[in-house]
Structure formats: C-alpha cells, structure tokens
C-alpha cells in the first residue's frame, strides 16, 4: 500500500480531495527578516519597494544572505525543524542575514495546488532579490536558498527567474511527487544557482517516494543511501511517543535532511563526509572511500563547491542523532582458499582496536557474496574515533541467526551428510579510512594459522611493511 | 500596551446567529495569528482553531468545522468569530488569544472573553 | 491529537505552601531540546493569562515564586510560596502540533 504522509493521512487522499471552503486567500509570500536568535521574537517584515525596513532592522548589504524556503504543509503553521535552522545559522554566521520565506497560504492546499505556487512563489523571491541588488553593495554571490521538500523546488524556480546568478542554493529532500523526472526548468537543477548541493533522505524505490530520487544538483549527497534513516526505525519512533506510526517515521527521515544541514552548521568541528560512489550497493560493499579527484565532500554548509559536468553522486553512514558523524573504513579480505562452503554465506563481524578506542562488534554485510582466491571489499564504519588502528579481530558467526540460513543449512546436511567442518584462509585484511585516506594492512598473529571456520575467530595485526599504493599516500581532505 | 478588546456578552434563541469581535491594539496585528477558545460553564479550555491575520486562511478543530466562521478586517486590526444555528450547547464563554508564528507559539495575549448565552 | 492529564484536578493549601501540579502527556512535547509545554492561570471570572512557556521560563512580570520544569511527556508546575492572589484554577497546554490541547486543569484554593 502507498505510504502514508502526515498526520492527517495519505498523500494520495490529499491529492484528489475537494478543496475546503475557506476565506478569499491573498496569493501572498512574506520575507520575514530574523533579527533575533530569540525564536519568539516576530522579527522584521521585508517588501519590495520599501526600503525603511532593511534601514529599521539593520540589513546587512556586504553580509551573507540565507533564505530559508518551508514546504507543503498541512497545519498551516511553521514546522519546530524552521527555528533550529535560523538559530544554527544566526550562531554560525553571526552577521548574517537570515530570512524566512513565508509562503503558508500558498503551502497550506492539497499537494497538487502547493506544488502549482512554487512557481509563483519563486518569482516572489526572484522579485525581492532583484529588488536587493538595486541597492548598493548587495551581491547575488551572497545569496544562499536553503529550501525543503517543496521549498527546494522553489528555491529552484528563484535562482532560474532572477536576474544574474545566486551563490548557492542546497536543496534539503526536495520532494519527488510531480517532480521525479521532470524536465530542468520544472524543478531544482544545476543551473539554478552557482552551486547547488543536496541532501536526500527519504527516497523509496517502492511505494511512494517523499523525496526526489534522482539528482538533481552539482553533489546530491544520499546519506545512508537516501533511504532508510537511522534512529527513524519504527521501534525508534514508538520509543519517543506513544503510539509510532509510520508518519512519524516519514517526517522523521525527510526532515532528516534538515537535522544533517543544522548538524553541520553547528558541529563543524566533526564534519560529516560524503563519497563519490555510481550507487548505493557499490558504496555499501566498500568500493567508494576515494578523495582523489574530487570524489570526497563535507556535507551540508562545509560543502566544497563541486561544478562537475554531470550530476555527482555521493554517500555517507550516519549516527542516529547529533553529532551525525561516523568513521568509514574499507575493508579489503582477500579469500584464498575455501573448503566446503555450501550455499550459505557466512556471516562475519569484525572488532577495530585503536589508539584511541575499541569499536564495538561490527557485522560484515556481504552484499552480493563472498569471492574465493579474490579480493572481497567490505564497508564498516564506527560511530567513535578509534585512532590509529592496532589490530582486528575477525568472527565467524556459528549458529545461523536466521531461518533462512537454517533451512539451507538443513537441505545442505540432507545433500551432504558428511559435509566436513566449512572453511576460509585469510592472510591479510587491508584497511583504508575514509576520513584520514590512510591505509594499512594487517596480517595473522599467527602466519601459520590464517584458518577460520563457524564460530571461531582469527586476530589481525598490522603488518611490518604497511602498505602504501602509488598516488594515494597523502589524504585530499583536510580535517580541522 | 498590547491589547485584545472583545465585543459585549451576547443573549441569543436557539437557530440565531451571533458575531463576536476581537479588536487588537498595540502590535502590528497581521504579524500574530488570532486564536479562538472556547469555555463551557465550569469547563475548561477548548481550542477552536486560528485565523491567519495576513492571509485571511482559517484554520478550524474538528468539532468546530461547519457553523462556525473566523473572518477578519484588518483595516481595524480585528477578528470576528461568527456562529450559525445556535444551540443551547454552544452557551460558553469565547476568548481570542493572539499567538506568534514563529517560535513555540504559546498564546500570549487573551482578550477578556465574550459570554455567549443561548436560551429560548 | 494530544492528550494533556493535568493531576491533582483540585487542591487544597495554606499560604506558605510549596504546591505542585503535574501534566503528563500522551506523547513527547518536545522537539530537540525545547519543550512546547506552557502554564496558564485563569482566575474566577477572568481570561487565563500565560505563567510559564516552554516548560520552564517565567513569562514577562509573573512573580519568581512560579516555576516549570520537565521534559518529553512529564511536566511540573511548582508555587514555592503559596500567596492568597494564586487562588485559581491552572492549566497546561502544548503546542507542539496543530491542535493546541490543554490539560483539564488543577484548581487551587486555600485552606
């Protein structure tokens, strides 16, 4: 069944049912100018053509500009996540200008109407921002549109409608219905600012998809996949009210997209990085923990621009709340000798021992399937910084945790009853930080013991000689 | 001083209607959403819903959708609530209560409340 | 919607009294570190008149001896020093999401 969106039922009912009888609506979008960190304070009202306001309320001209653009909505209201992000950005750039685009009324319809406003709407910005430029020292270079779901899209619509070209625009889960696939001048593209990053975190290749699949800027960042959230589980969400639903989930991962953006305004110190990767499946197995050549960004506000030709895919893990920094690894196993394995894959964890910490047991997720005599590449990743690495304990899980794998193992007895004990020969895991883009490699305790088998576990140590490949010795990323 | 002056008490026969008025002063009246609550006699308080002051968009509970109408004349900084078709039932007291839209929009500003009386 | 159990639903204290009224709600009311839990008091014949927001500050000339606490779904309203003008009856409410819903109220009277 499609999923359900918002409290007040599915996004599909919403789409087609009639429009309530209401007061006459003034098509209207106001610029409210945040003059305080005080989220109470009403802050200052700004029009095109008055220019008392800007004067009243201290507009800064030689400053940045940030307007923050909301989505649909079915309260009518400002959502919570709106106030973070104007106190995020007034503590990260103190002489900011921070402007709430409000565009409620024009929000507050059946999805299909909403998503007919943006475009108005982002003539409205395009309008207040040509206005701006007419004064002296304004520059369109300073102009950053933050928009979300729905406000993405018109943030689009403004950088394509304004005279010139806006600094940046991030798009934070722009949503998908009406949008996925739709031609550059229908939605959020590259060429609507100088630099268009993009946060997506709720995308669904089954079912309805809130946010927008496809990307649409210079990076499109998909955190953990772009998909399923951590922390925004179910189980997660029944923890934190009394009855979980799946809107809660929903608003929880879309607006995940959010919390990242705050996350890097206000935790710079621990910036999250994204890596360049064709798809998520590829990211998972490991293969994309590359800095060279552009292929490593921070997330959020700290992103480096990236004008790339074409689209630029990038992944990251998170934690489940903030700071959501991790610390990815590549894991390289090479598998030279296997004995009786029979249809199950094996399943395997791994624990990281640092100079600075232990990781906790982490399991090894077999993507596709585990290769004999070749280089199998995993993805691990550790919420706490480990340090210099110091040794590996690799595990093979003995009992089979799932039905699945019992049943295979049972019809695998019946084929074979005297299947001898199942086997693998591991000398050296070769292991390369994504943050760092250090490499190391680790070999057995014991070089004659490189045997592990269900339910046993082999000790890894770093190697004597290291390990160093040509060209990718020195980390391209910096580190604060 | 900010204020929220509200229209007299009202005594009205079942199947009338009655208009109450909640008229602000002190604020820039479109910058604050105007609420309405109602009171039951011995009751407590009952969000009604809440009329964008900018936009004119109203926003009514469940319970409340139907006969009863907010409107607006901000040329005199002024919320109406009007209902319809009255019923002993609807014998309340009715506030207005002014509410930001930003921030955690609890209601800062009451008016002193209109006793709506419905009697045959 | 939210429902806010506001306990006791009356009580009975001499002034100098420490009194203490509970809102429990039946899910979180808070986003992040801030709570959109508030405490109004509405004294006979009047219009309630906001005391504490955001759980625990004390709106624009309501006297110290009022306070808030409490986060998620459990609140406290507190009178450290219970004076004769605090006879009222006084309610929670929450604004996290549309509706606004309050609690059924606590009234308050002196011994």
């Known amino acids: 069944s499609p999923v359900p969106f918002g409290p007040e039922g599915r996004l599909e009912d919403k789409l087609h049912k009639p429009k309530a009888t209401q007061t006459e609506v003034k098509p209207s979008v106001r610029f409210n100018l945040r003059t305080s960190k005080d989220p109470e304070h009403e802050g200052c009202y700004l029009s095109v053509g008055h220019s008392q306001p800007l004067e009243d309320c201290s507009f800064n001209m030689t400053a940045k500009t940030f307007f923050i653009i909301h989505g649909w909505t079915m309260s009518g209201i400002f959502e919570n996540w709106l106030h973070k992000l104007v106190s995020a950005l007034h503590t990260r750039e103190k002489d900011a200008n921070v402007v709430v685009v409000d565009w409620l009324p024009l929000a507050h319809q059946l999805y299909t109407d909403a998503v007919n406003n943006t475009r108005v709407v982002g003539h409205s910005i395009a309008r207040m921002l040509d206005w701006l430029q007419e004064k002296d020292d304004f520059s369109l270079g300073n102009v950053h549109l933050i928009g979300y779901s729905l406000g993405a899209h018109v943030a689009g619509y403004a950088g394509n409608f304004v005279k010139g070209t806006v600094g940046r625009i991030t798009g934070l889960d722009p949503a998908g219905p009406m949008f996925e696939g739709a031609d550059i001048h229908k939605r959020l593209s590259p060429d609507d600012a100088d630099f268009v990053d993009v946060l997506h975190t709720y995308t669904r290749s089954f079912g309805l998809s809130i946010g927008i699949q496809m990307p649409v800027g210079h990076i499109d960042i998909y955190p953990n996949g772009g998909d399923f959230q951590p922390g925004c589980g179910l189980n997660d969400v029944l923890g934190s009210i009394a009855y979980g639903t799946i809107t809660e989930v929903v608003k929880c991962e879309h607006e995940r997209a959010v919390h990242l953006f705050v996350d890097s305004l206000v935790n710079q110190d621990k910036p999250s990085f994204a890596f360049q990767c064709t798809d998520s499946n590829r990211f998972k197995k490991g293969i994309c923990l590359s800095c060279r050549k552009n292929r490593c960004n921070s997330i959020g506000y700290n992103a480096k621009k990236m004008r790339n030709k074409r689209n630029s895919k990038m992944y990251l893990k998170t934690r489940a709340g903030m700071p959501f920094r991790v610390y990815h690894y590549q894991m390289k196993i090479h598998v030279f000798s296997y004995k009786n394995m029979g249809e199950i894959e094996p399943t395997f964890y791994v624990t990281l021992y640092g100079t600075n910490a232990d990781s906790q047991t982490l399991p090894l997720e077999i993507v596709e399937r585990i290769e004999q005599n070749a280089t199998n590449t995993f993805l691990v990743y550790t919420e706490e910084d480990l340090g210099d690495l110091l040794k590996i304990q690799l595990t093979w899980e003995g009992a089979s945790q799932s039905w699945y794998n019992l049943w295979k193992e049972f019809r695998s007895y019946l084929s074979q009853p005297r299947n001898p004990g199942r086997e693998l020969n591991i000398r050296r895991i070769r292991v390369k930080s994504g943050e760092t883009q250090r490499k190391l490699t680790f070999c057995t305790e014991d070089p004659e013991n490189t045997s592990i088998s269900p339910g046993r576990e082999l000790w890894f140590r770093k190697c004597r000689d290291g390990w160093r490949m040509k060209n990718e010795t020195s980390p391209t990323v910096e580190l604060p | 001083q900010v204020q929220l002056v509200q229209s007299g008490s009202e005594l009205k026969k079942p199947g009338a209607s009655v208009k109450v008025s909640c008229k602000a002063s002190g604020y820039t009246f479109t910058n604050y959403g105007m609420n309405w609550v109602r009171q039951a006699p011995g009751q407590g308080l009952e969000w009604m819903g809440w009329i964008n002051t900018y936009s004119g968009v109203p926003t009514y509970a469940g319970d409340f959708k139907g006969r009863f109408v907010f409107s607006l004349d901000t040329s005199v900084s002024t919320a109406y609530l009007q209902i319809s078709s009255l019923k002993a039932e609807d014998t309340a007291v009715y506030y207005c209560a002014r509410r930001g839209y930003y921030g955690r929009r609890y209601f800062d500003v009451w008016g002193k409340g209109t006793t709506v009386t419905v009697s045959s | 919607d939210i429902q806010l159990t506001q306990s006791p639903s009356s009580l009975s204290a001499s002034v100098g009294d420490r009194v203490t009224i509970t809102c429990k709600a039946s899910?979180?009311?808070?986003?992040?570190?801030?709570?959109?839990m508030h405490w109004y008091q509405q004294k006979p014949g009047k219009a309630p008149k906001l005391l504490i927001y955001?759980?625990?500050n004390l709106a624009s000339g309501v006297p110290s001896r009022f306070s808030g606490s409490g986060s998620g779904t459990d609140f406290t309203f507190t009178i450290s020093s219970l004076q004769p003008e605090d006879i009222a009856t006084y309610y929670c409410q929450q604004t996290i999401e549309d509706p606004p819903t309050f609690g059924g109220g606590t009234k308050v009277e002196i011994k």
């Open positions: 899910q979180s009311v808070d986003y992040d570190v801030d709570s959109y």
């Open positions: 955001a759980a625990s």
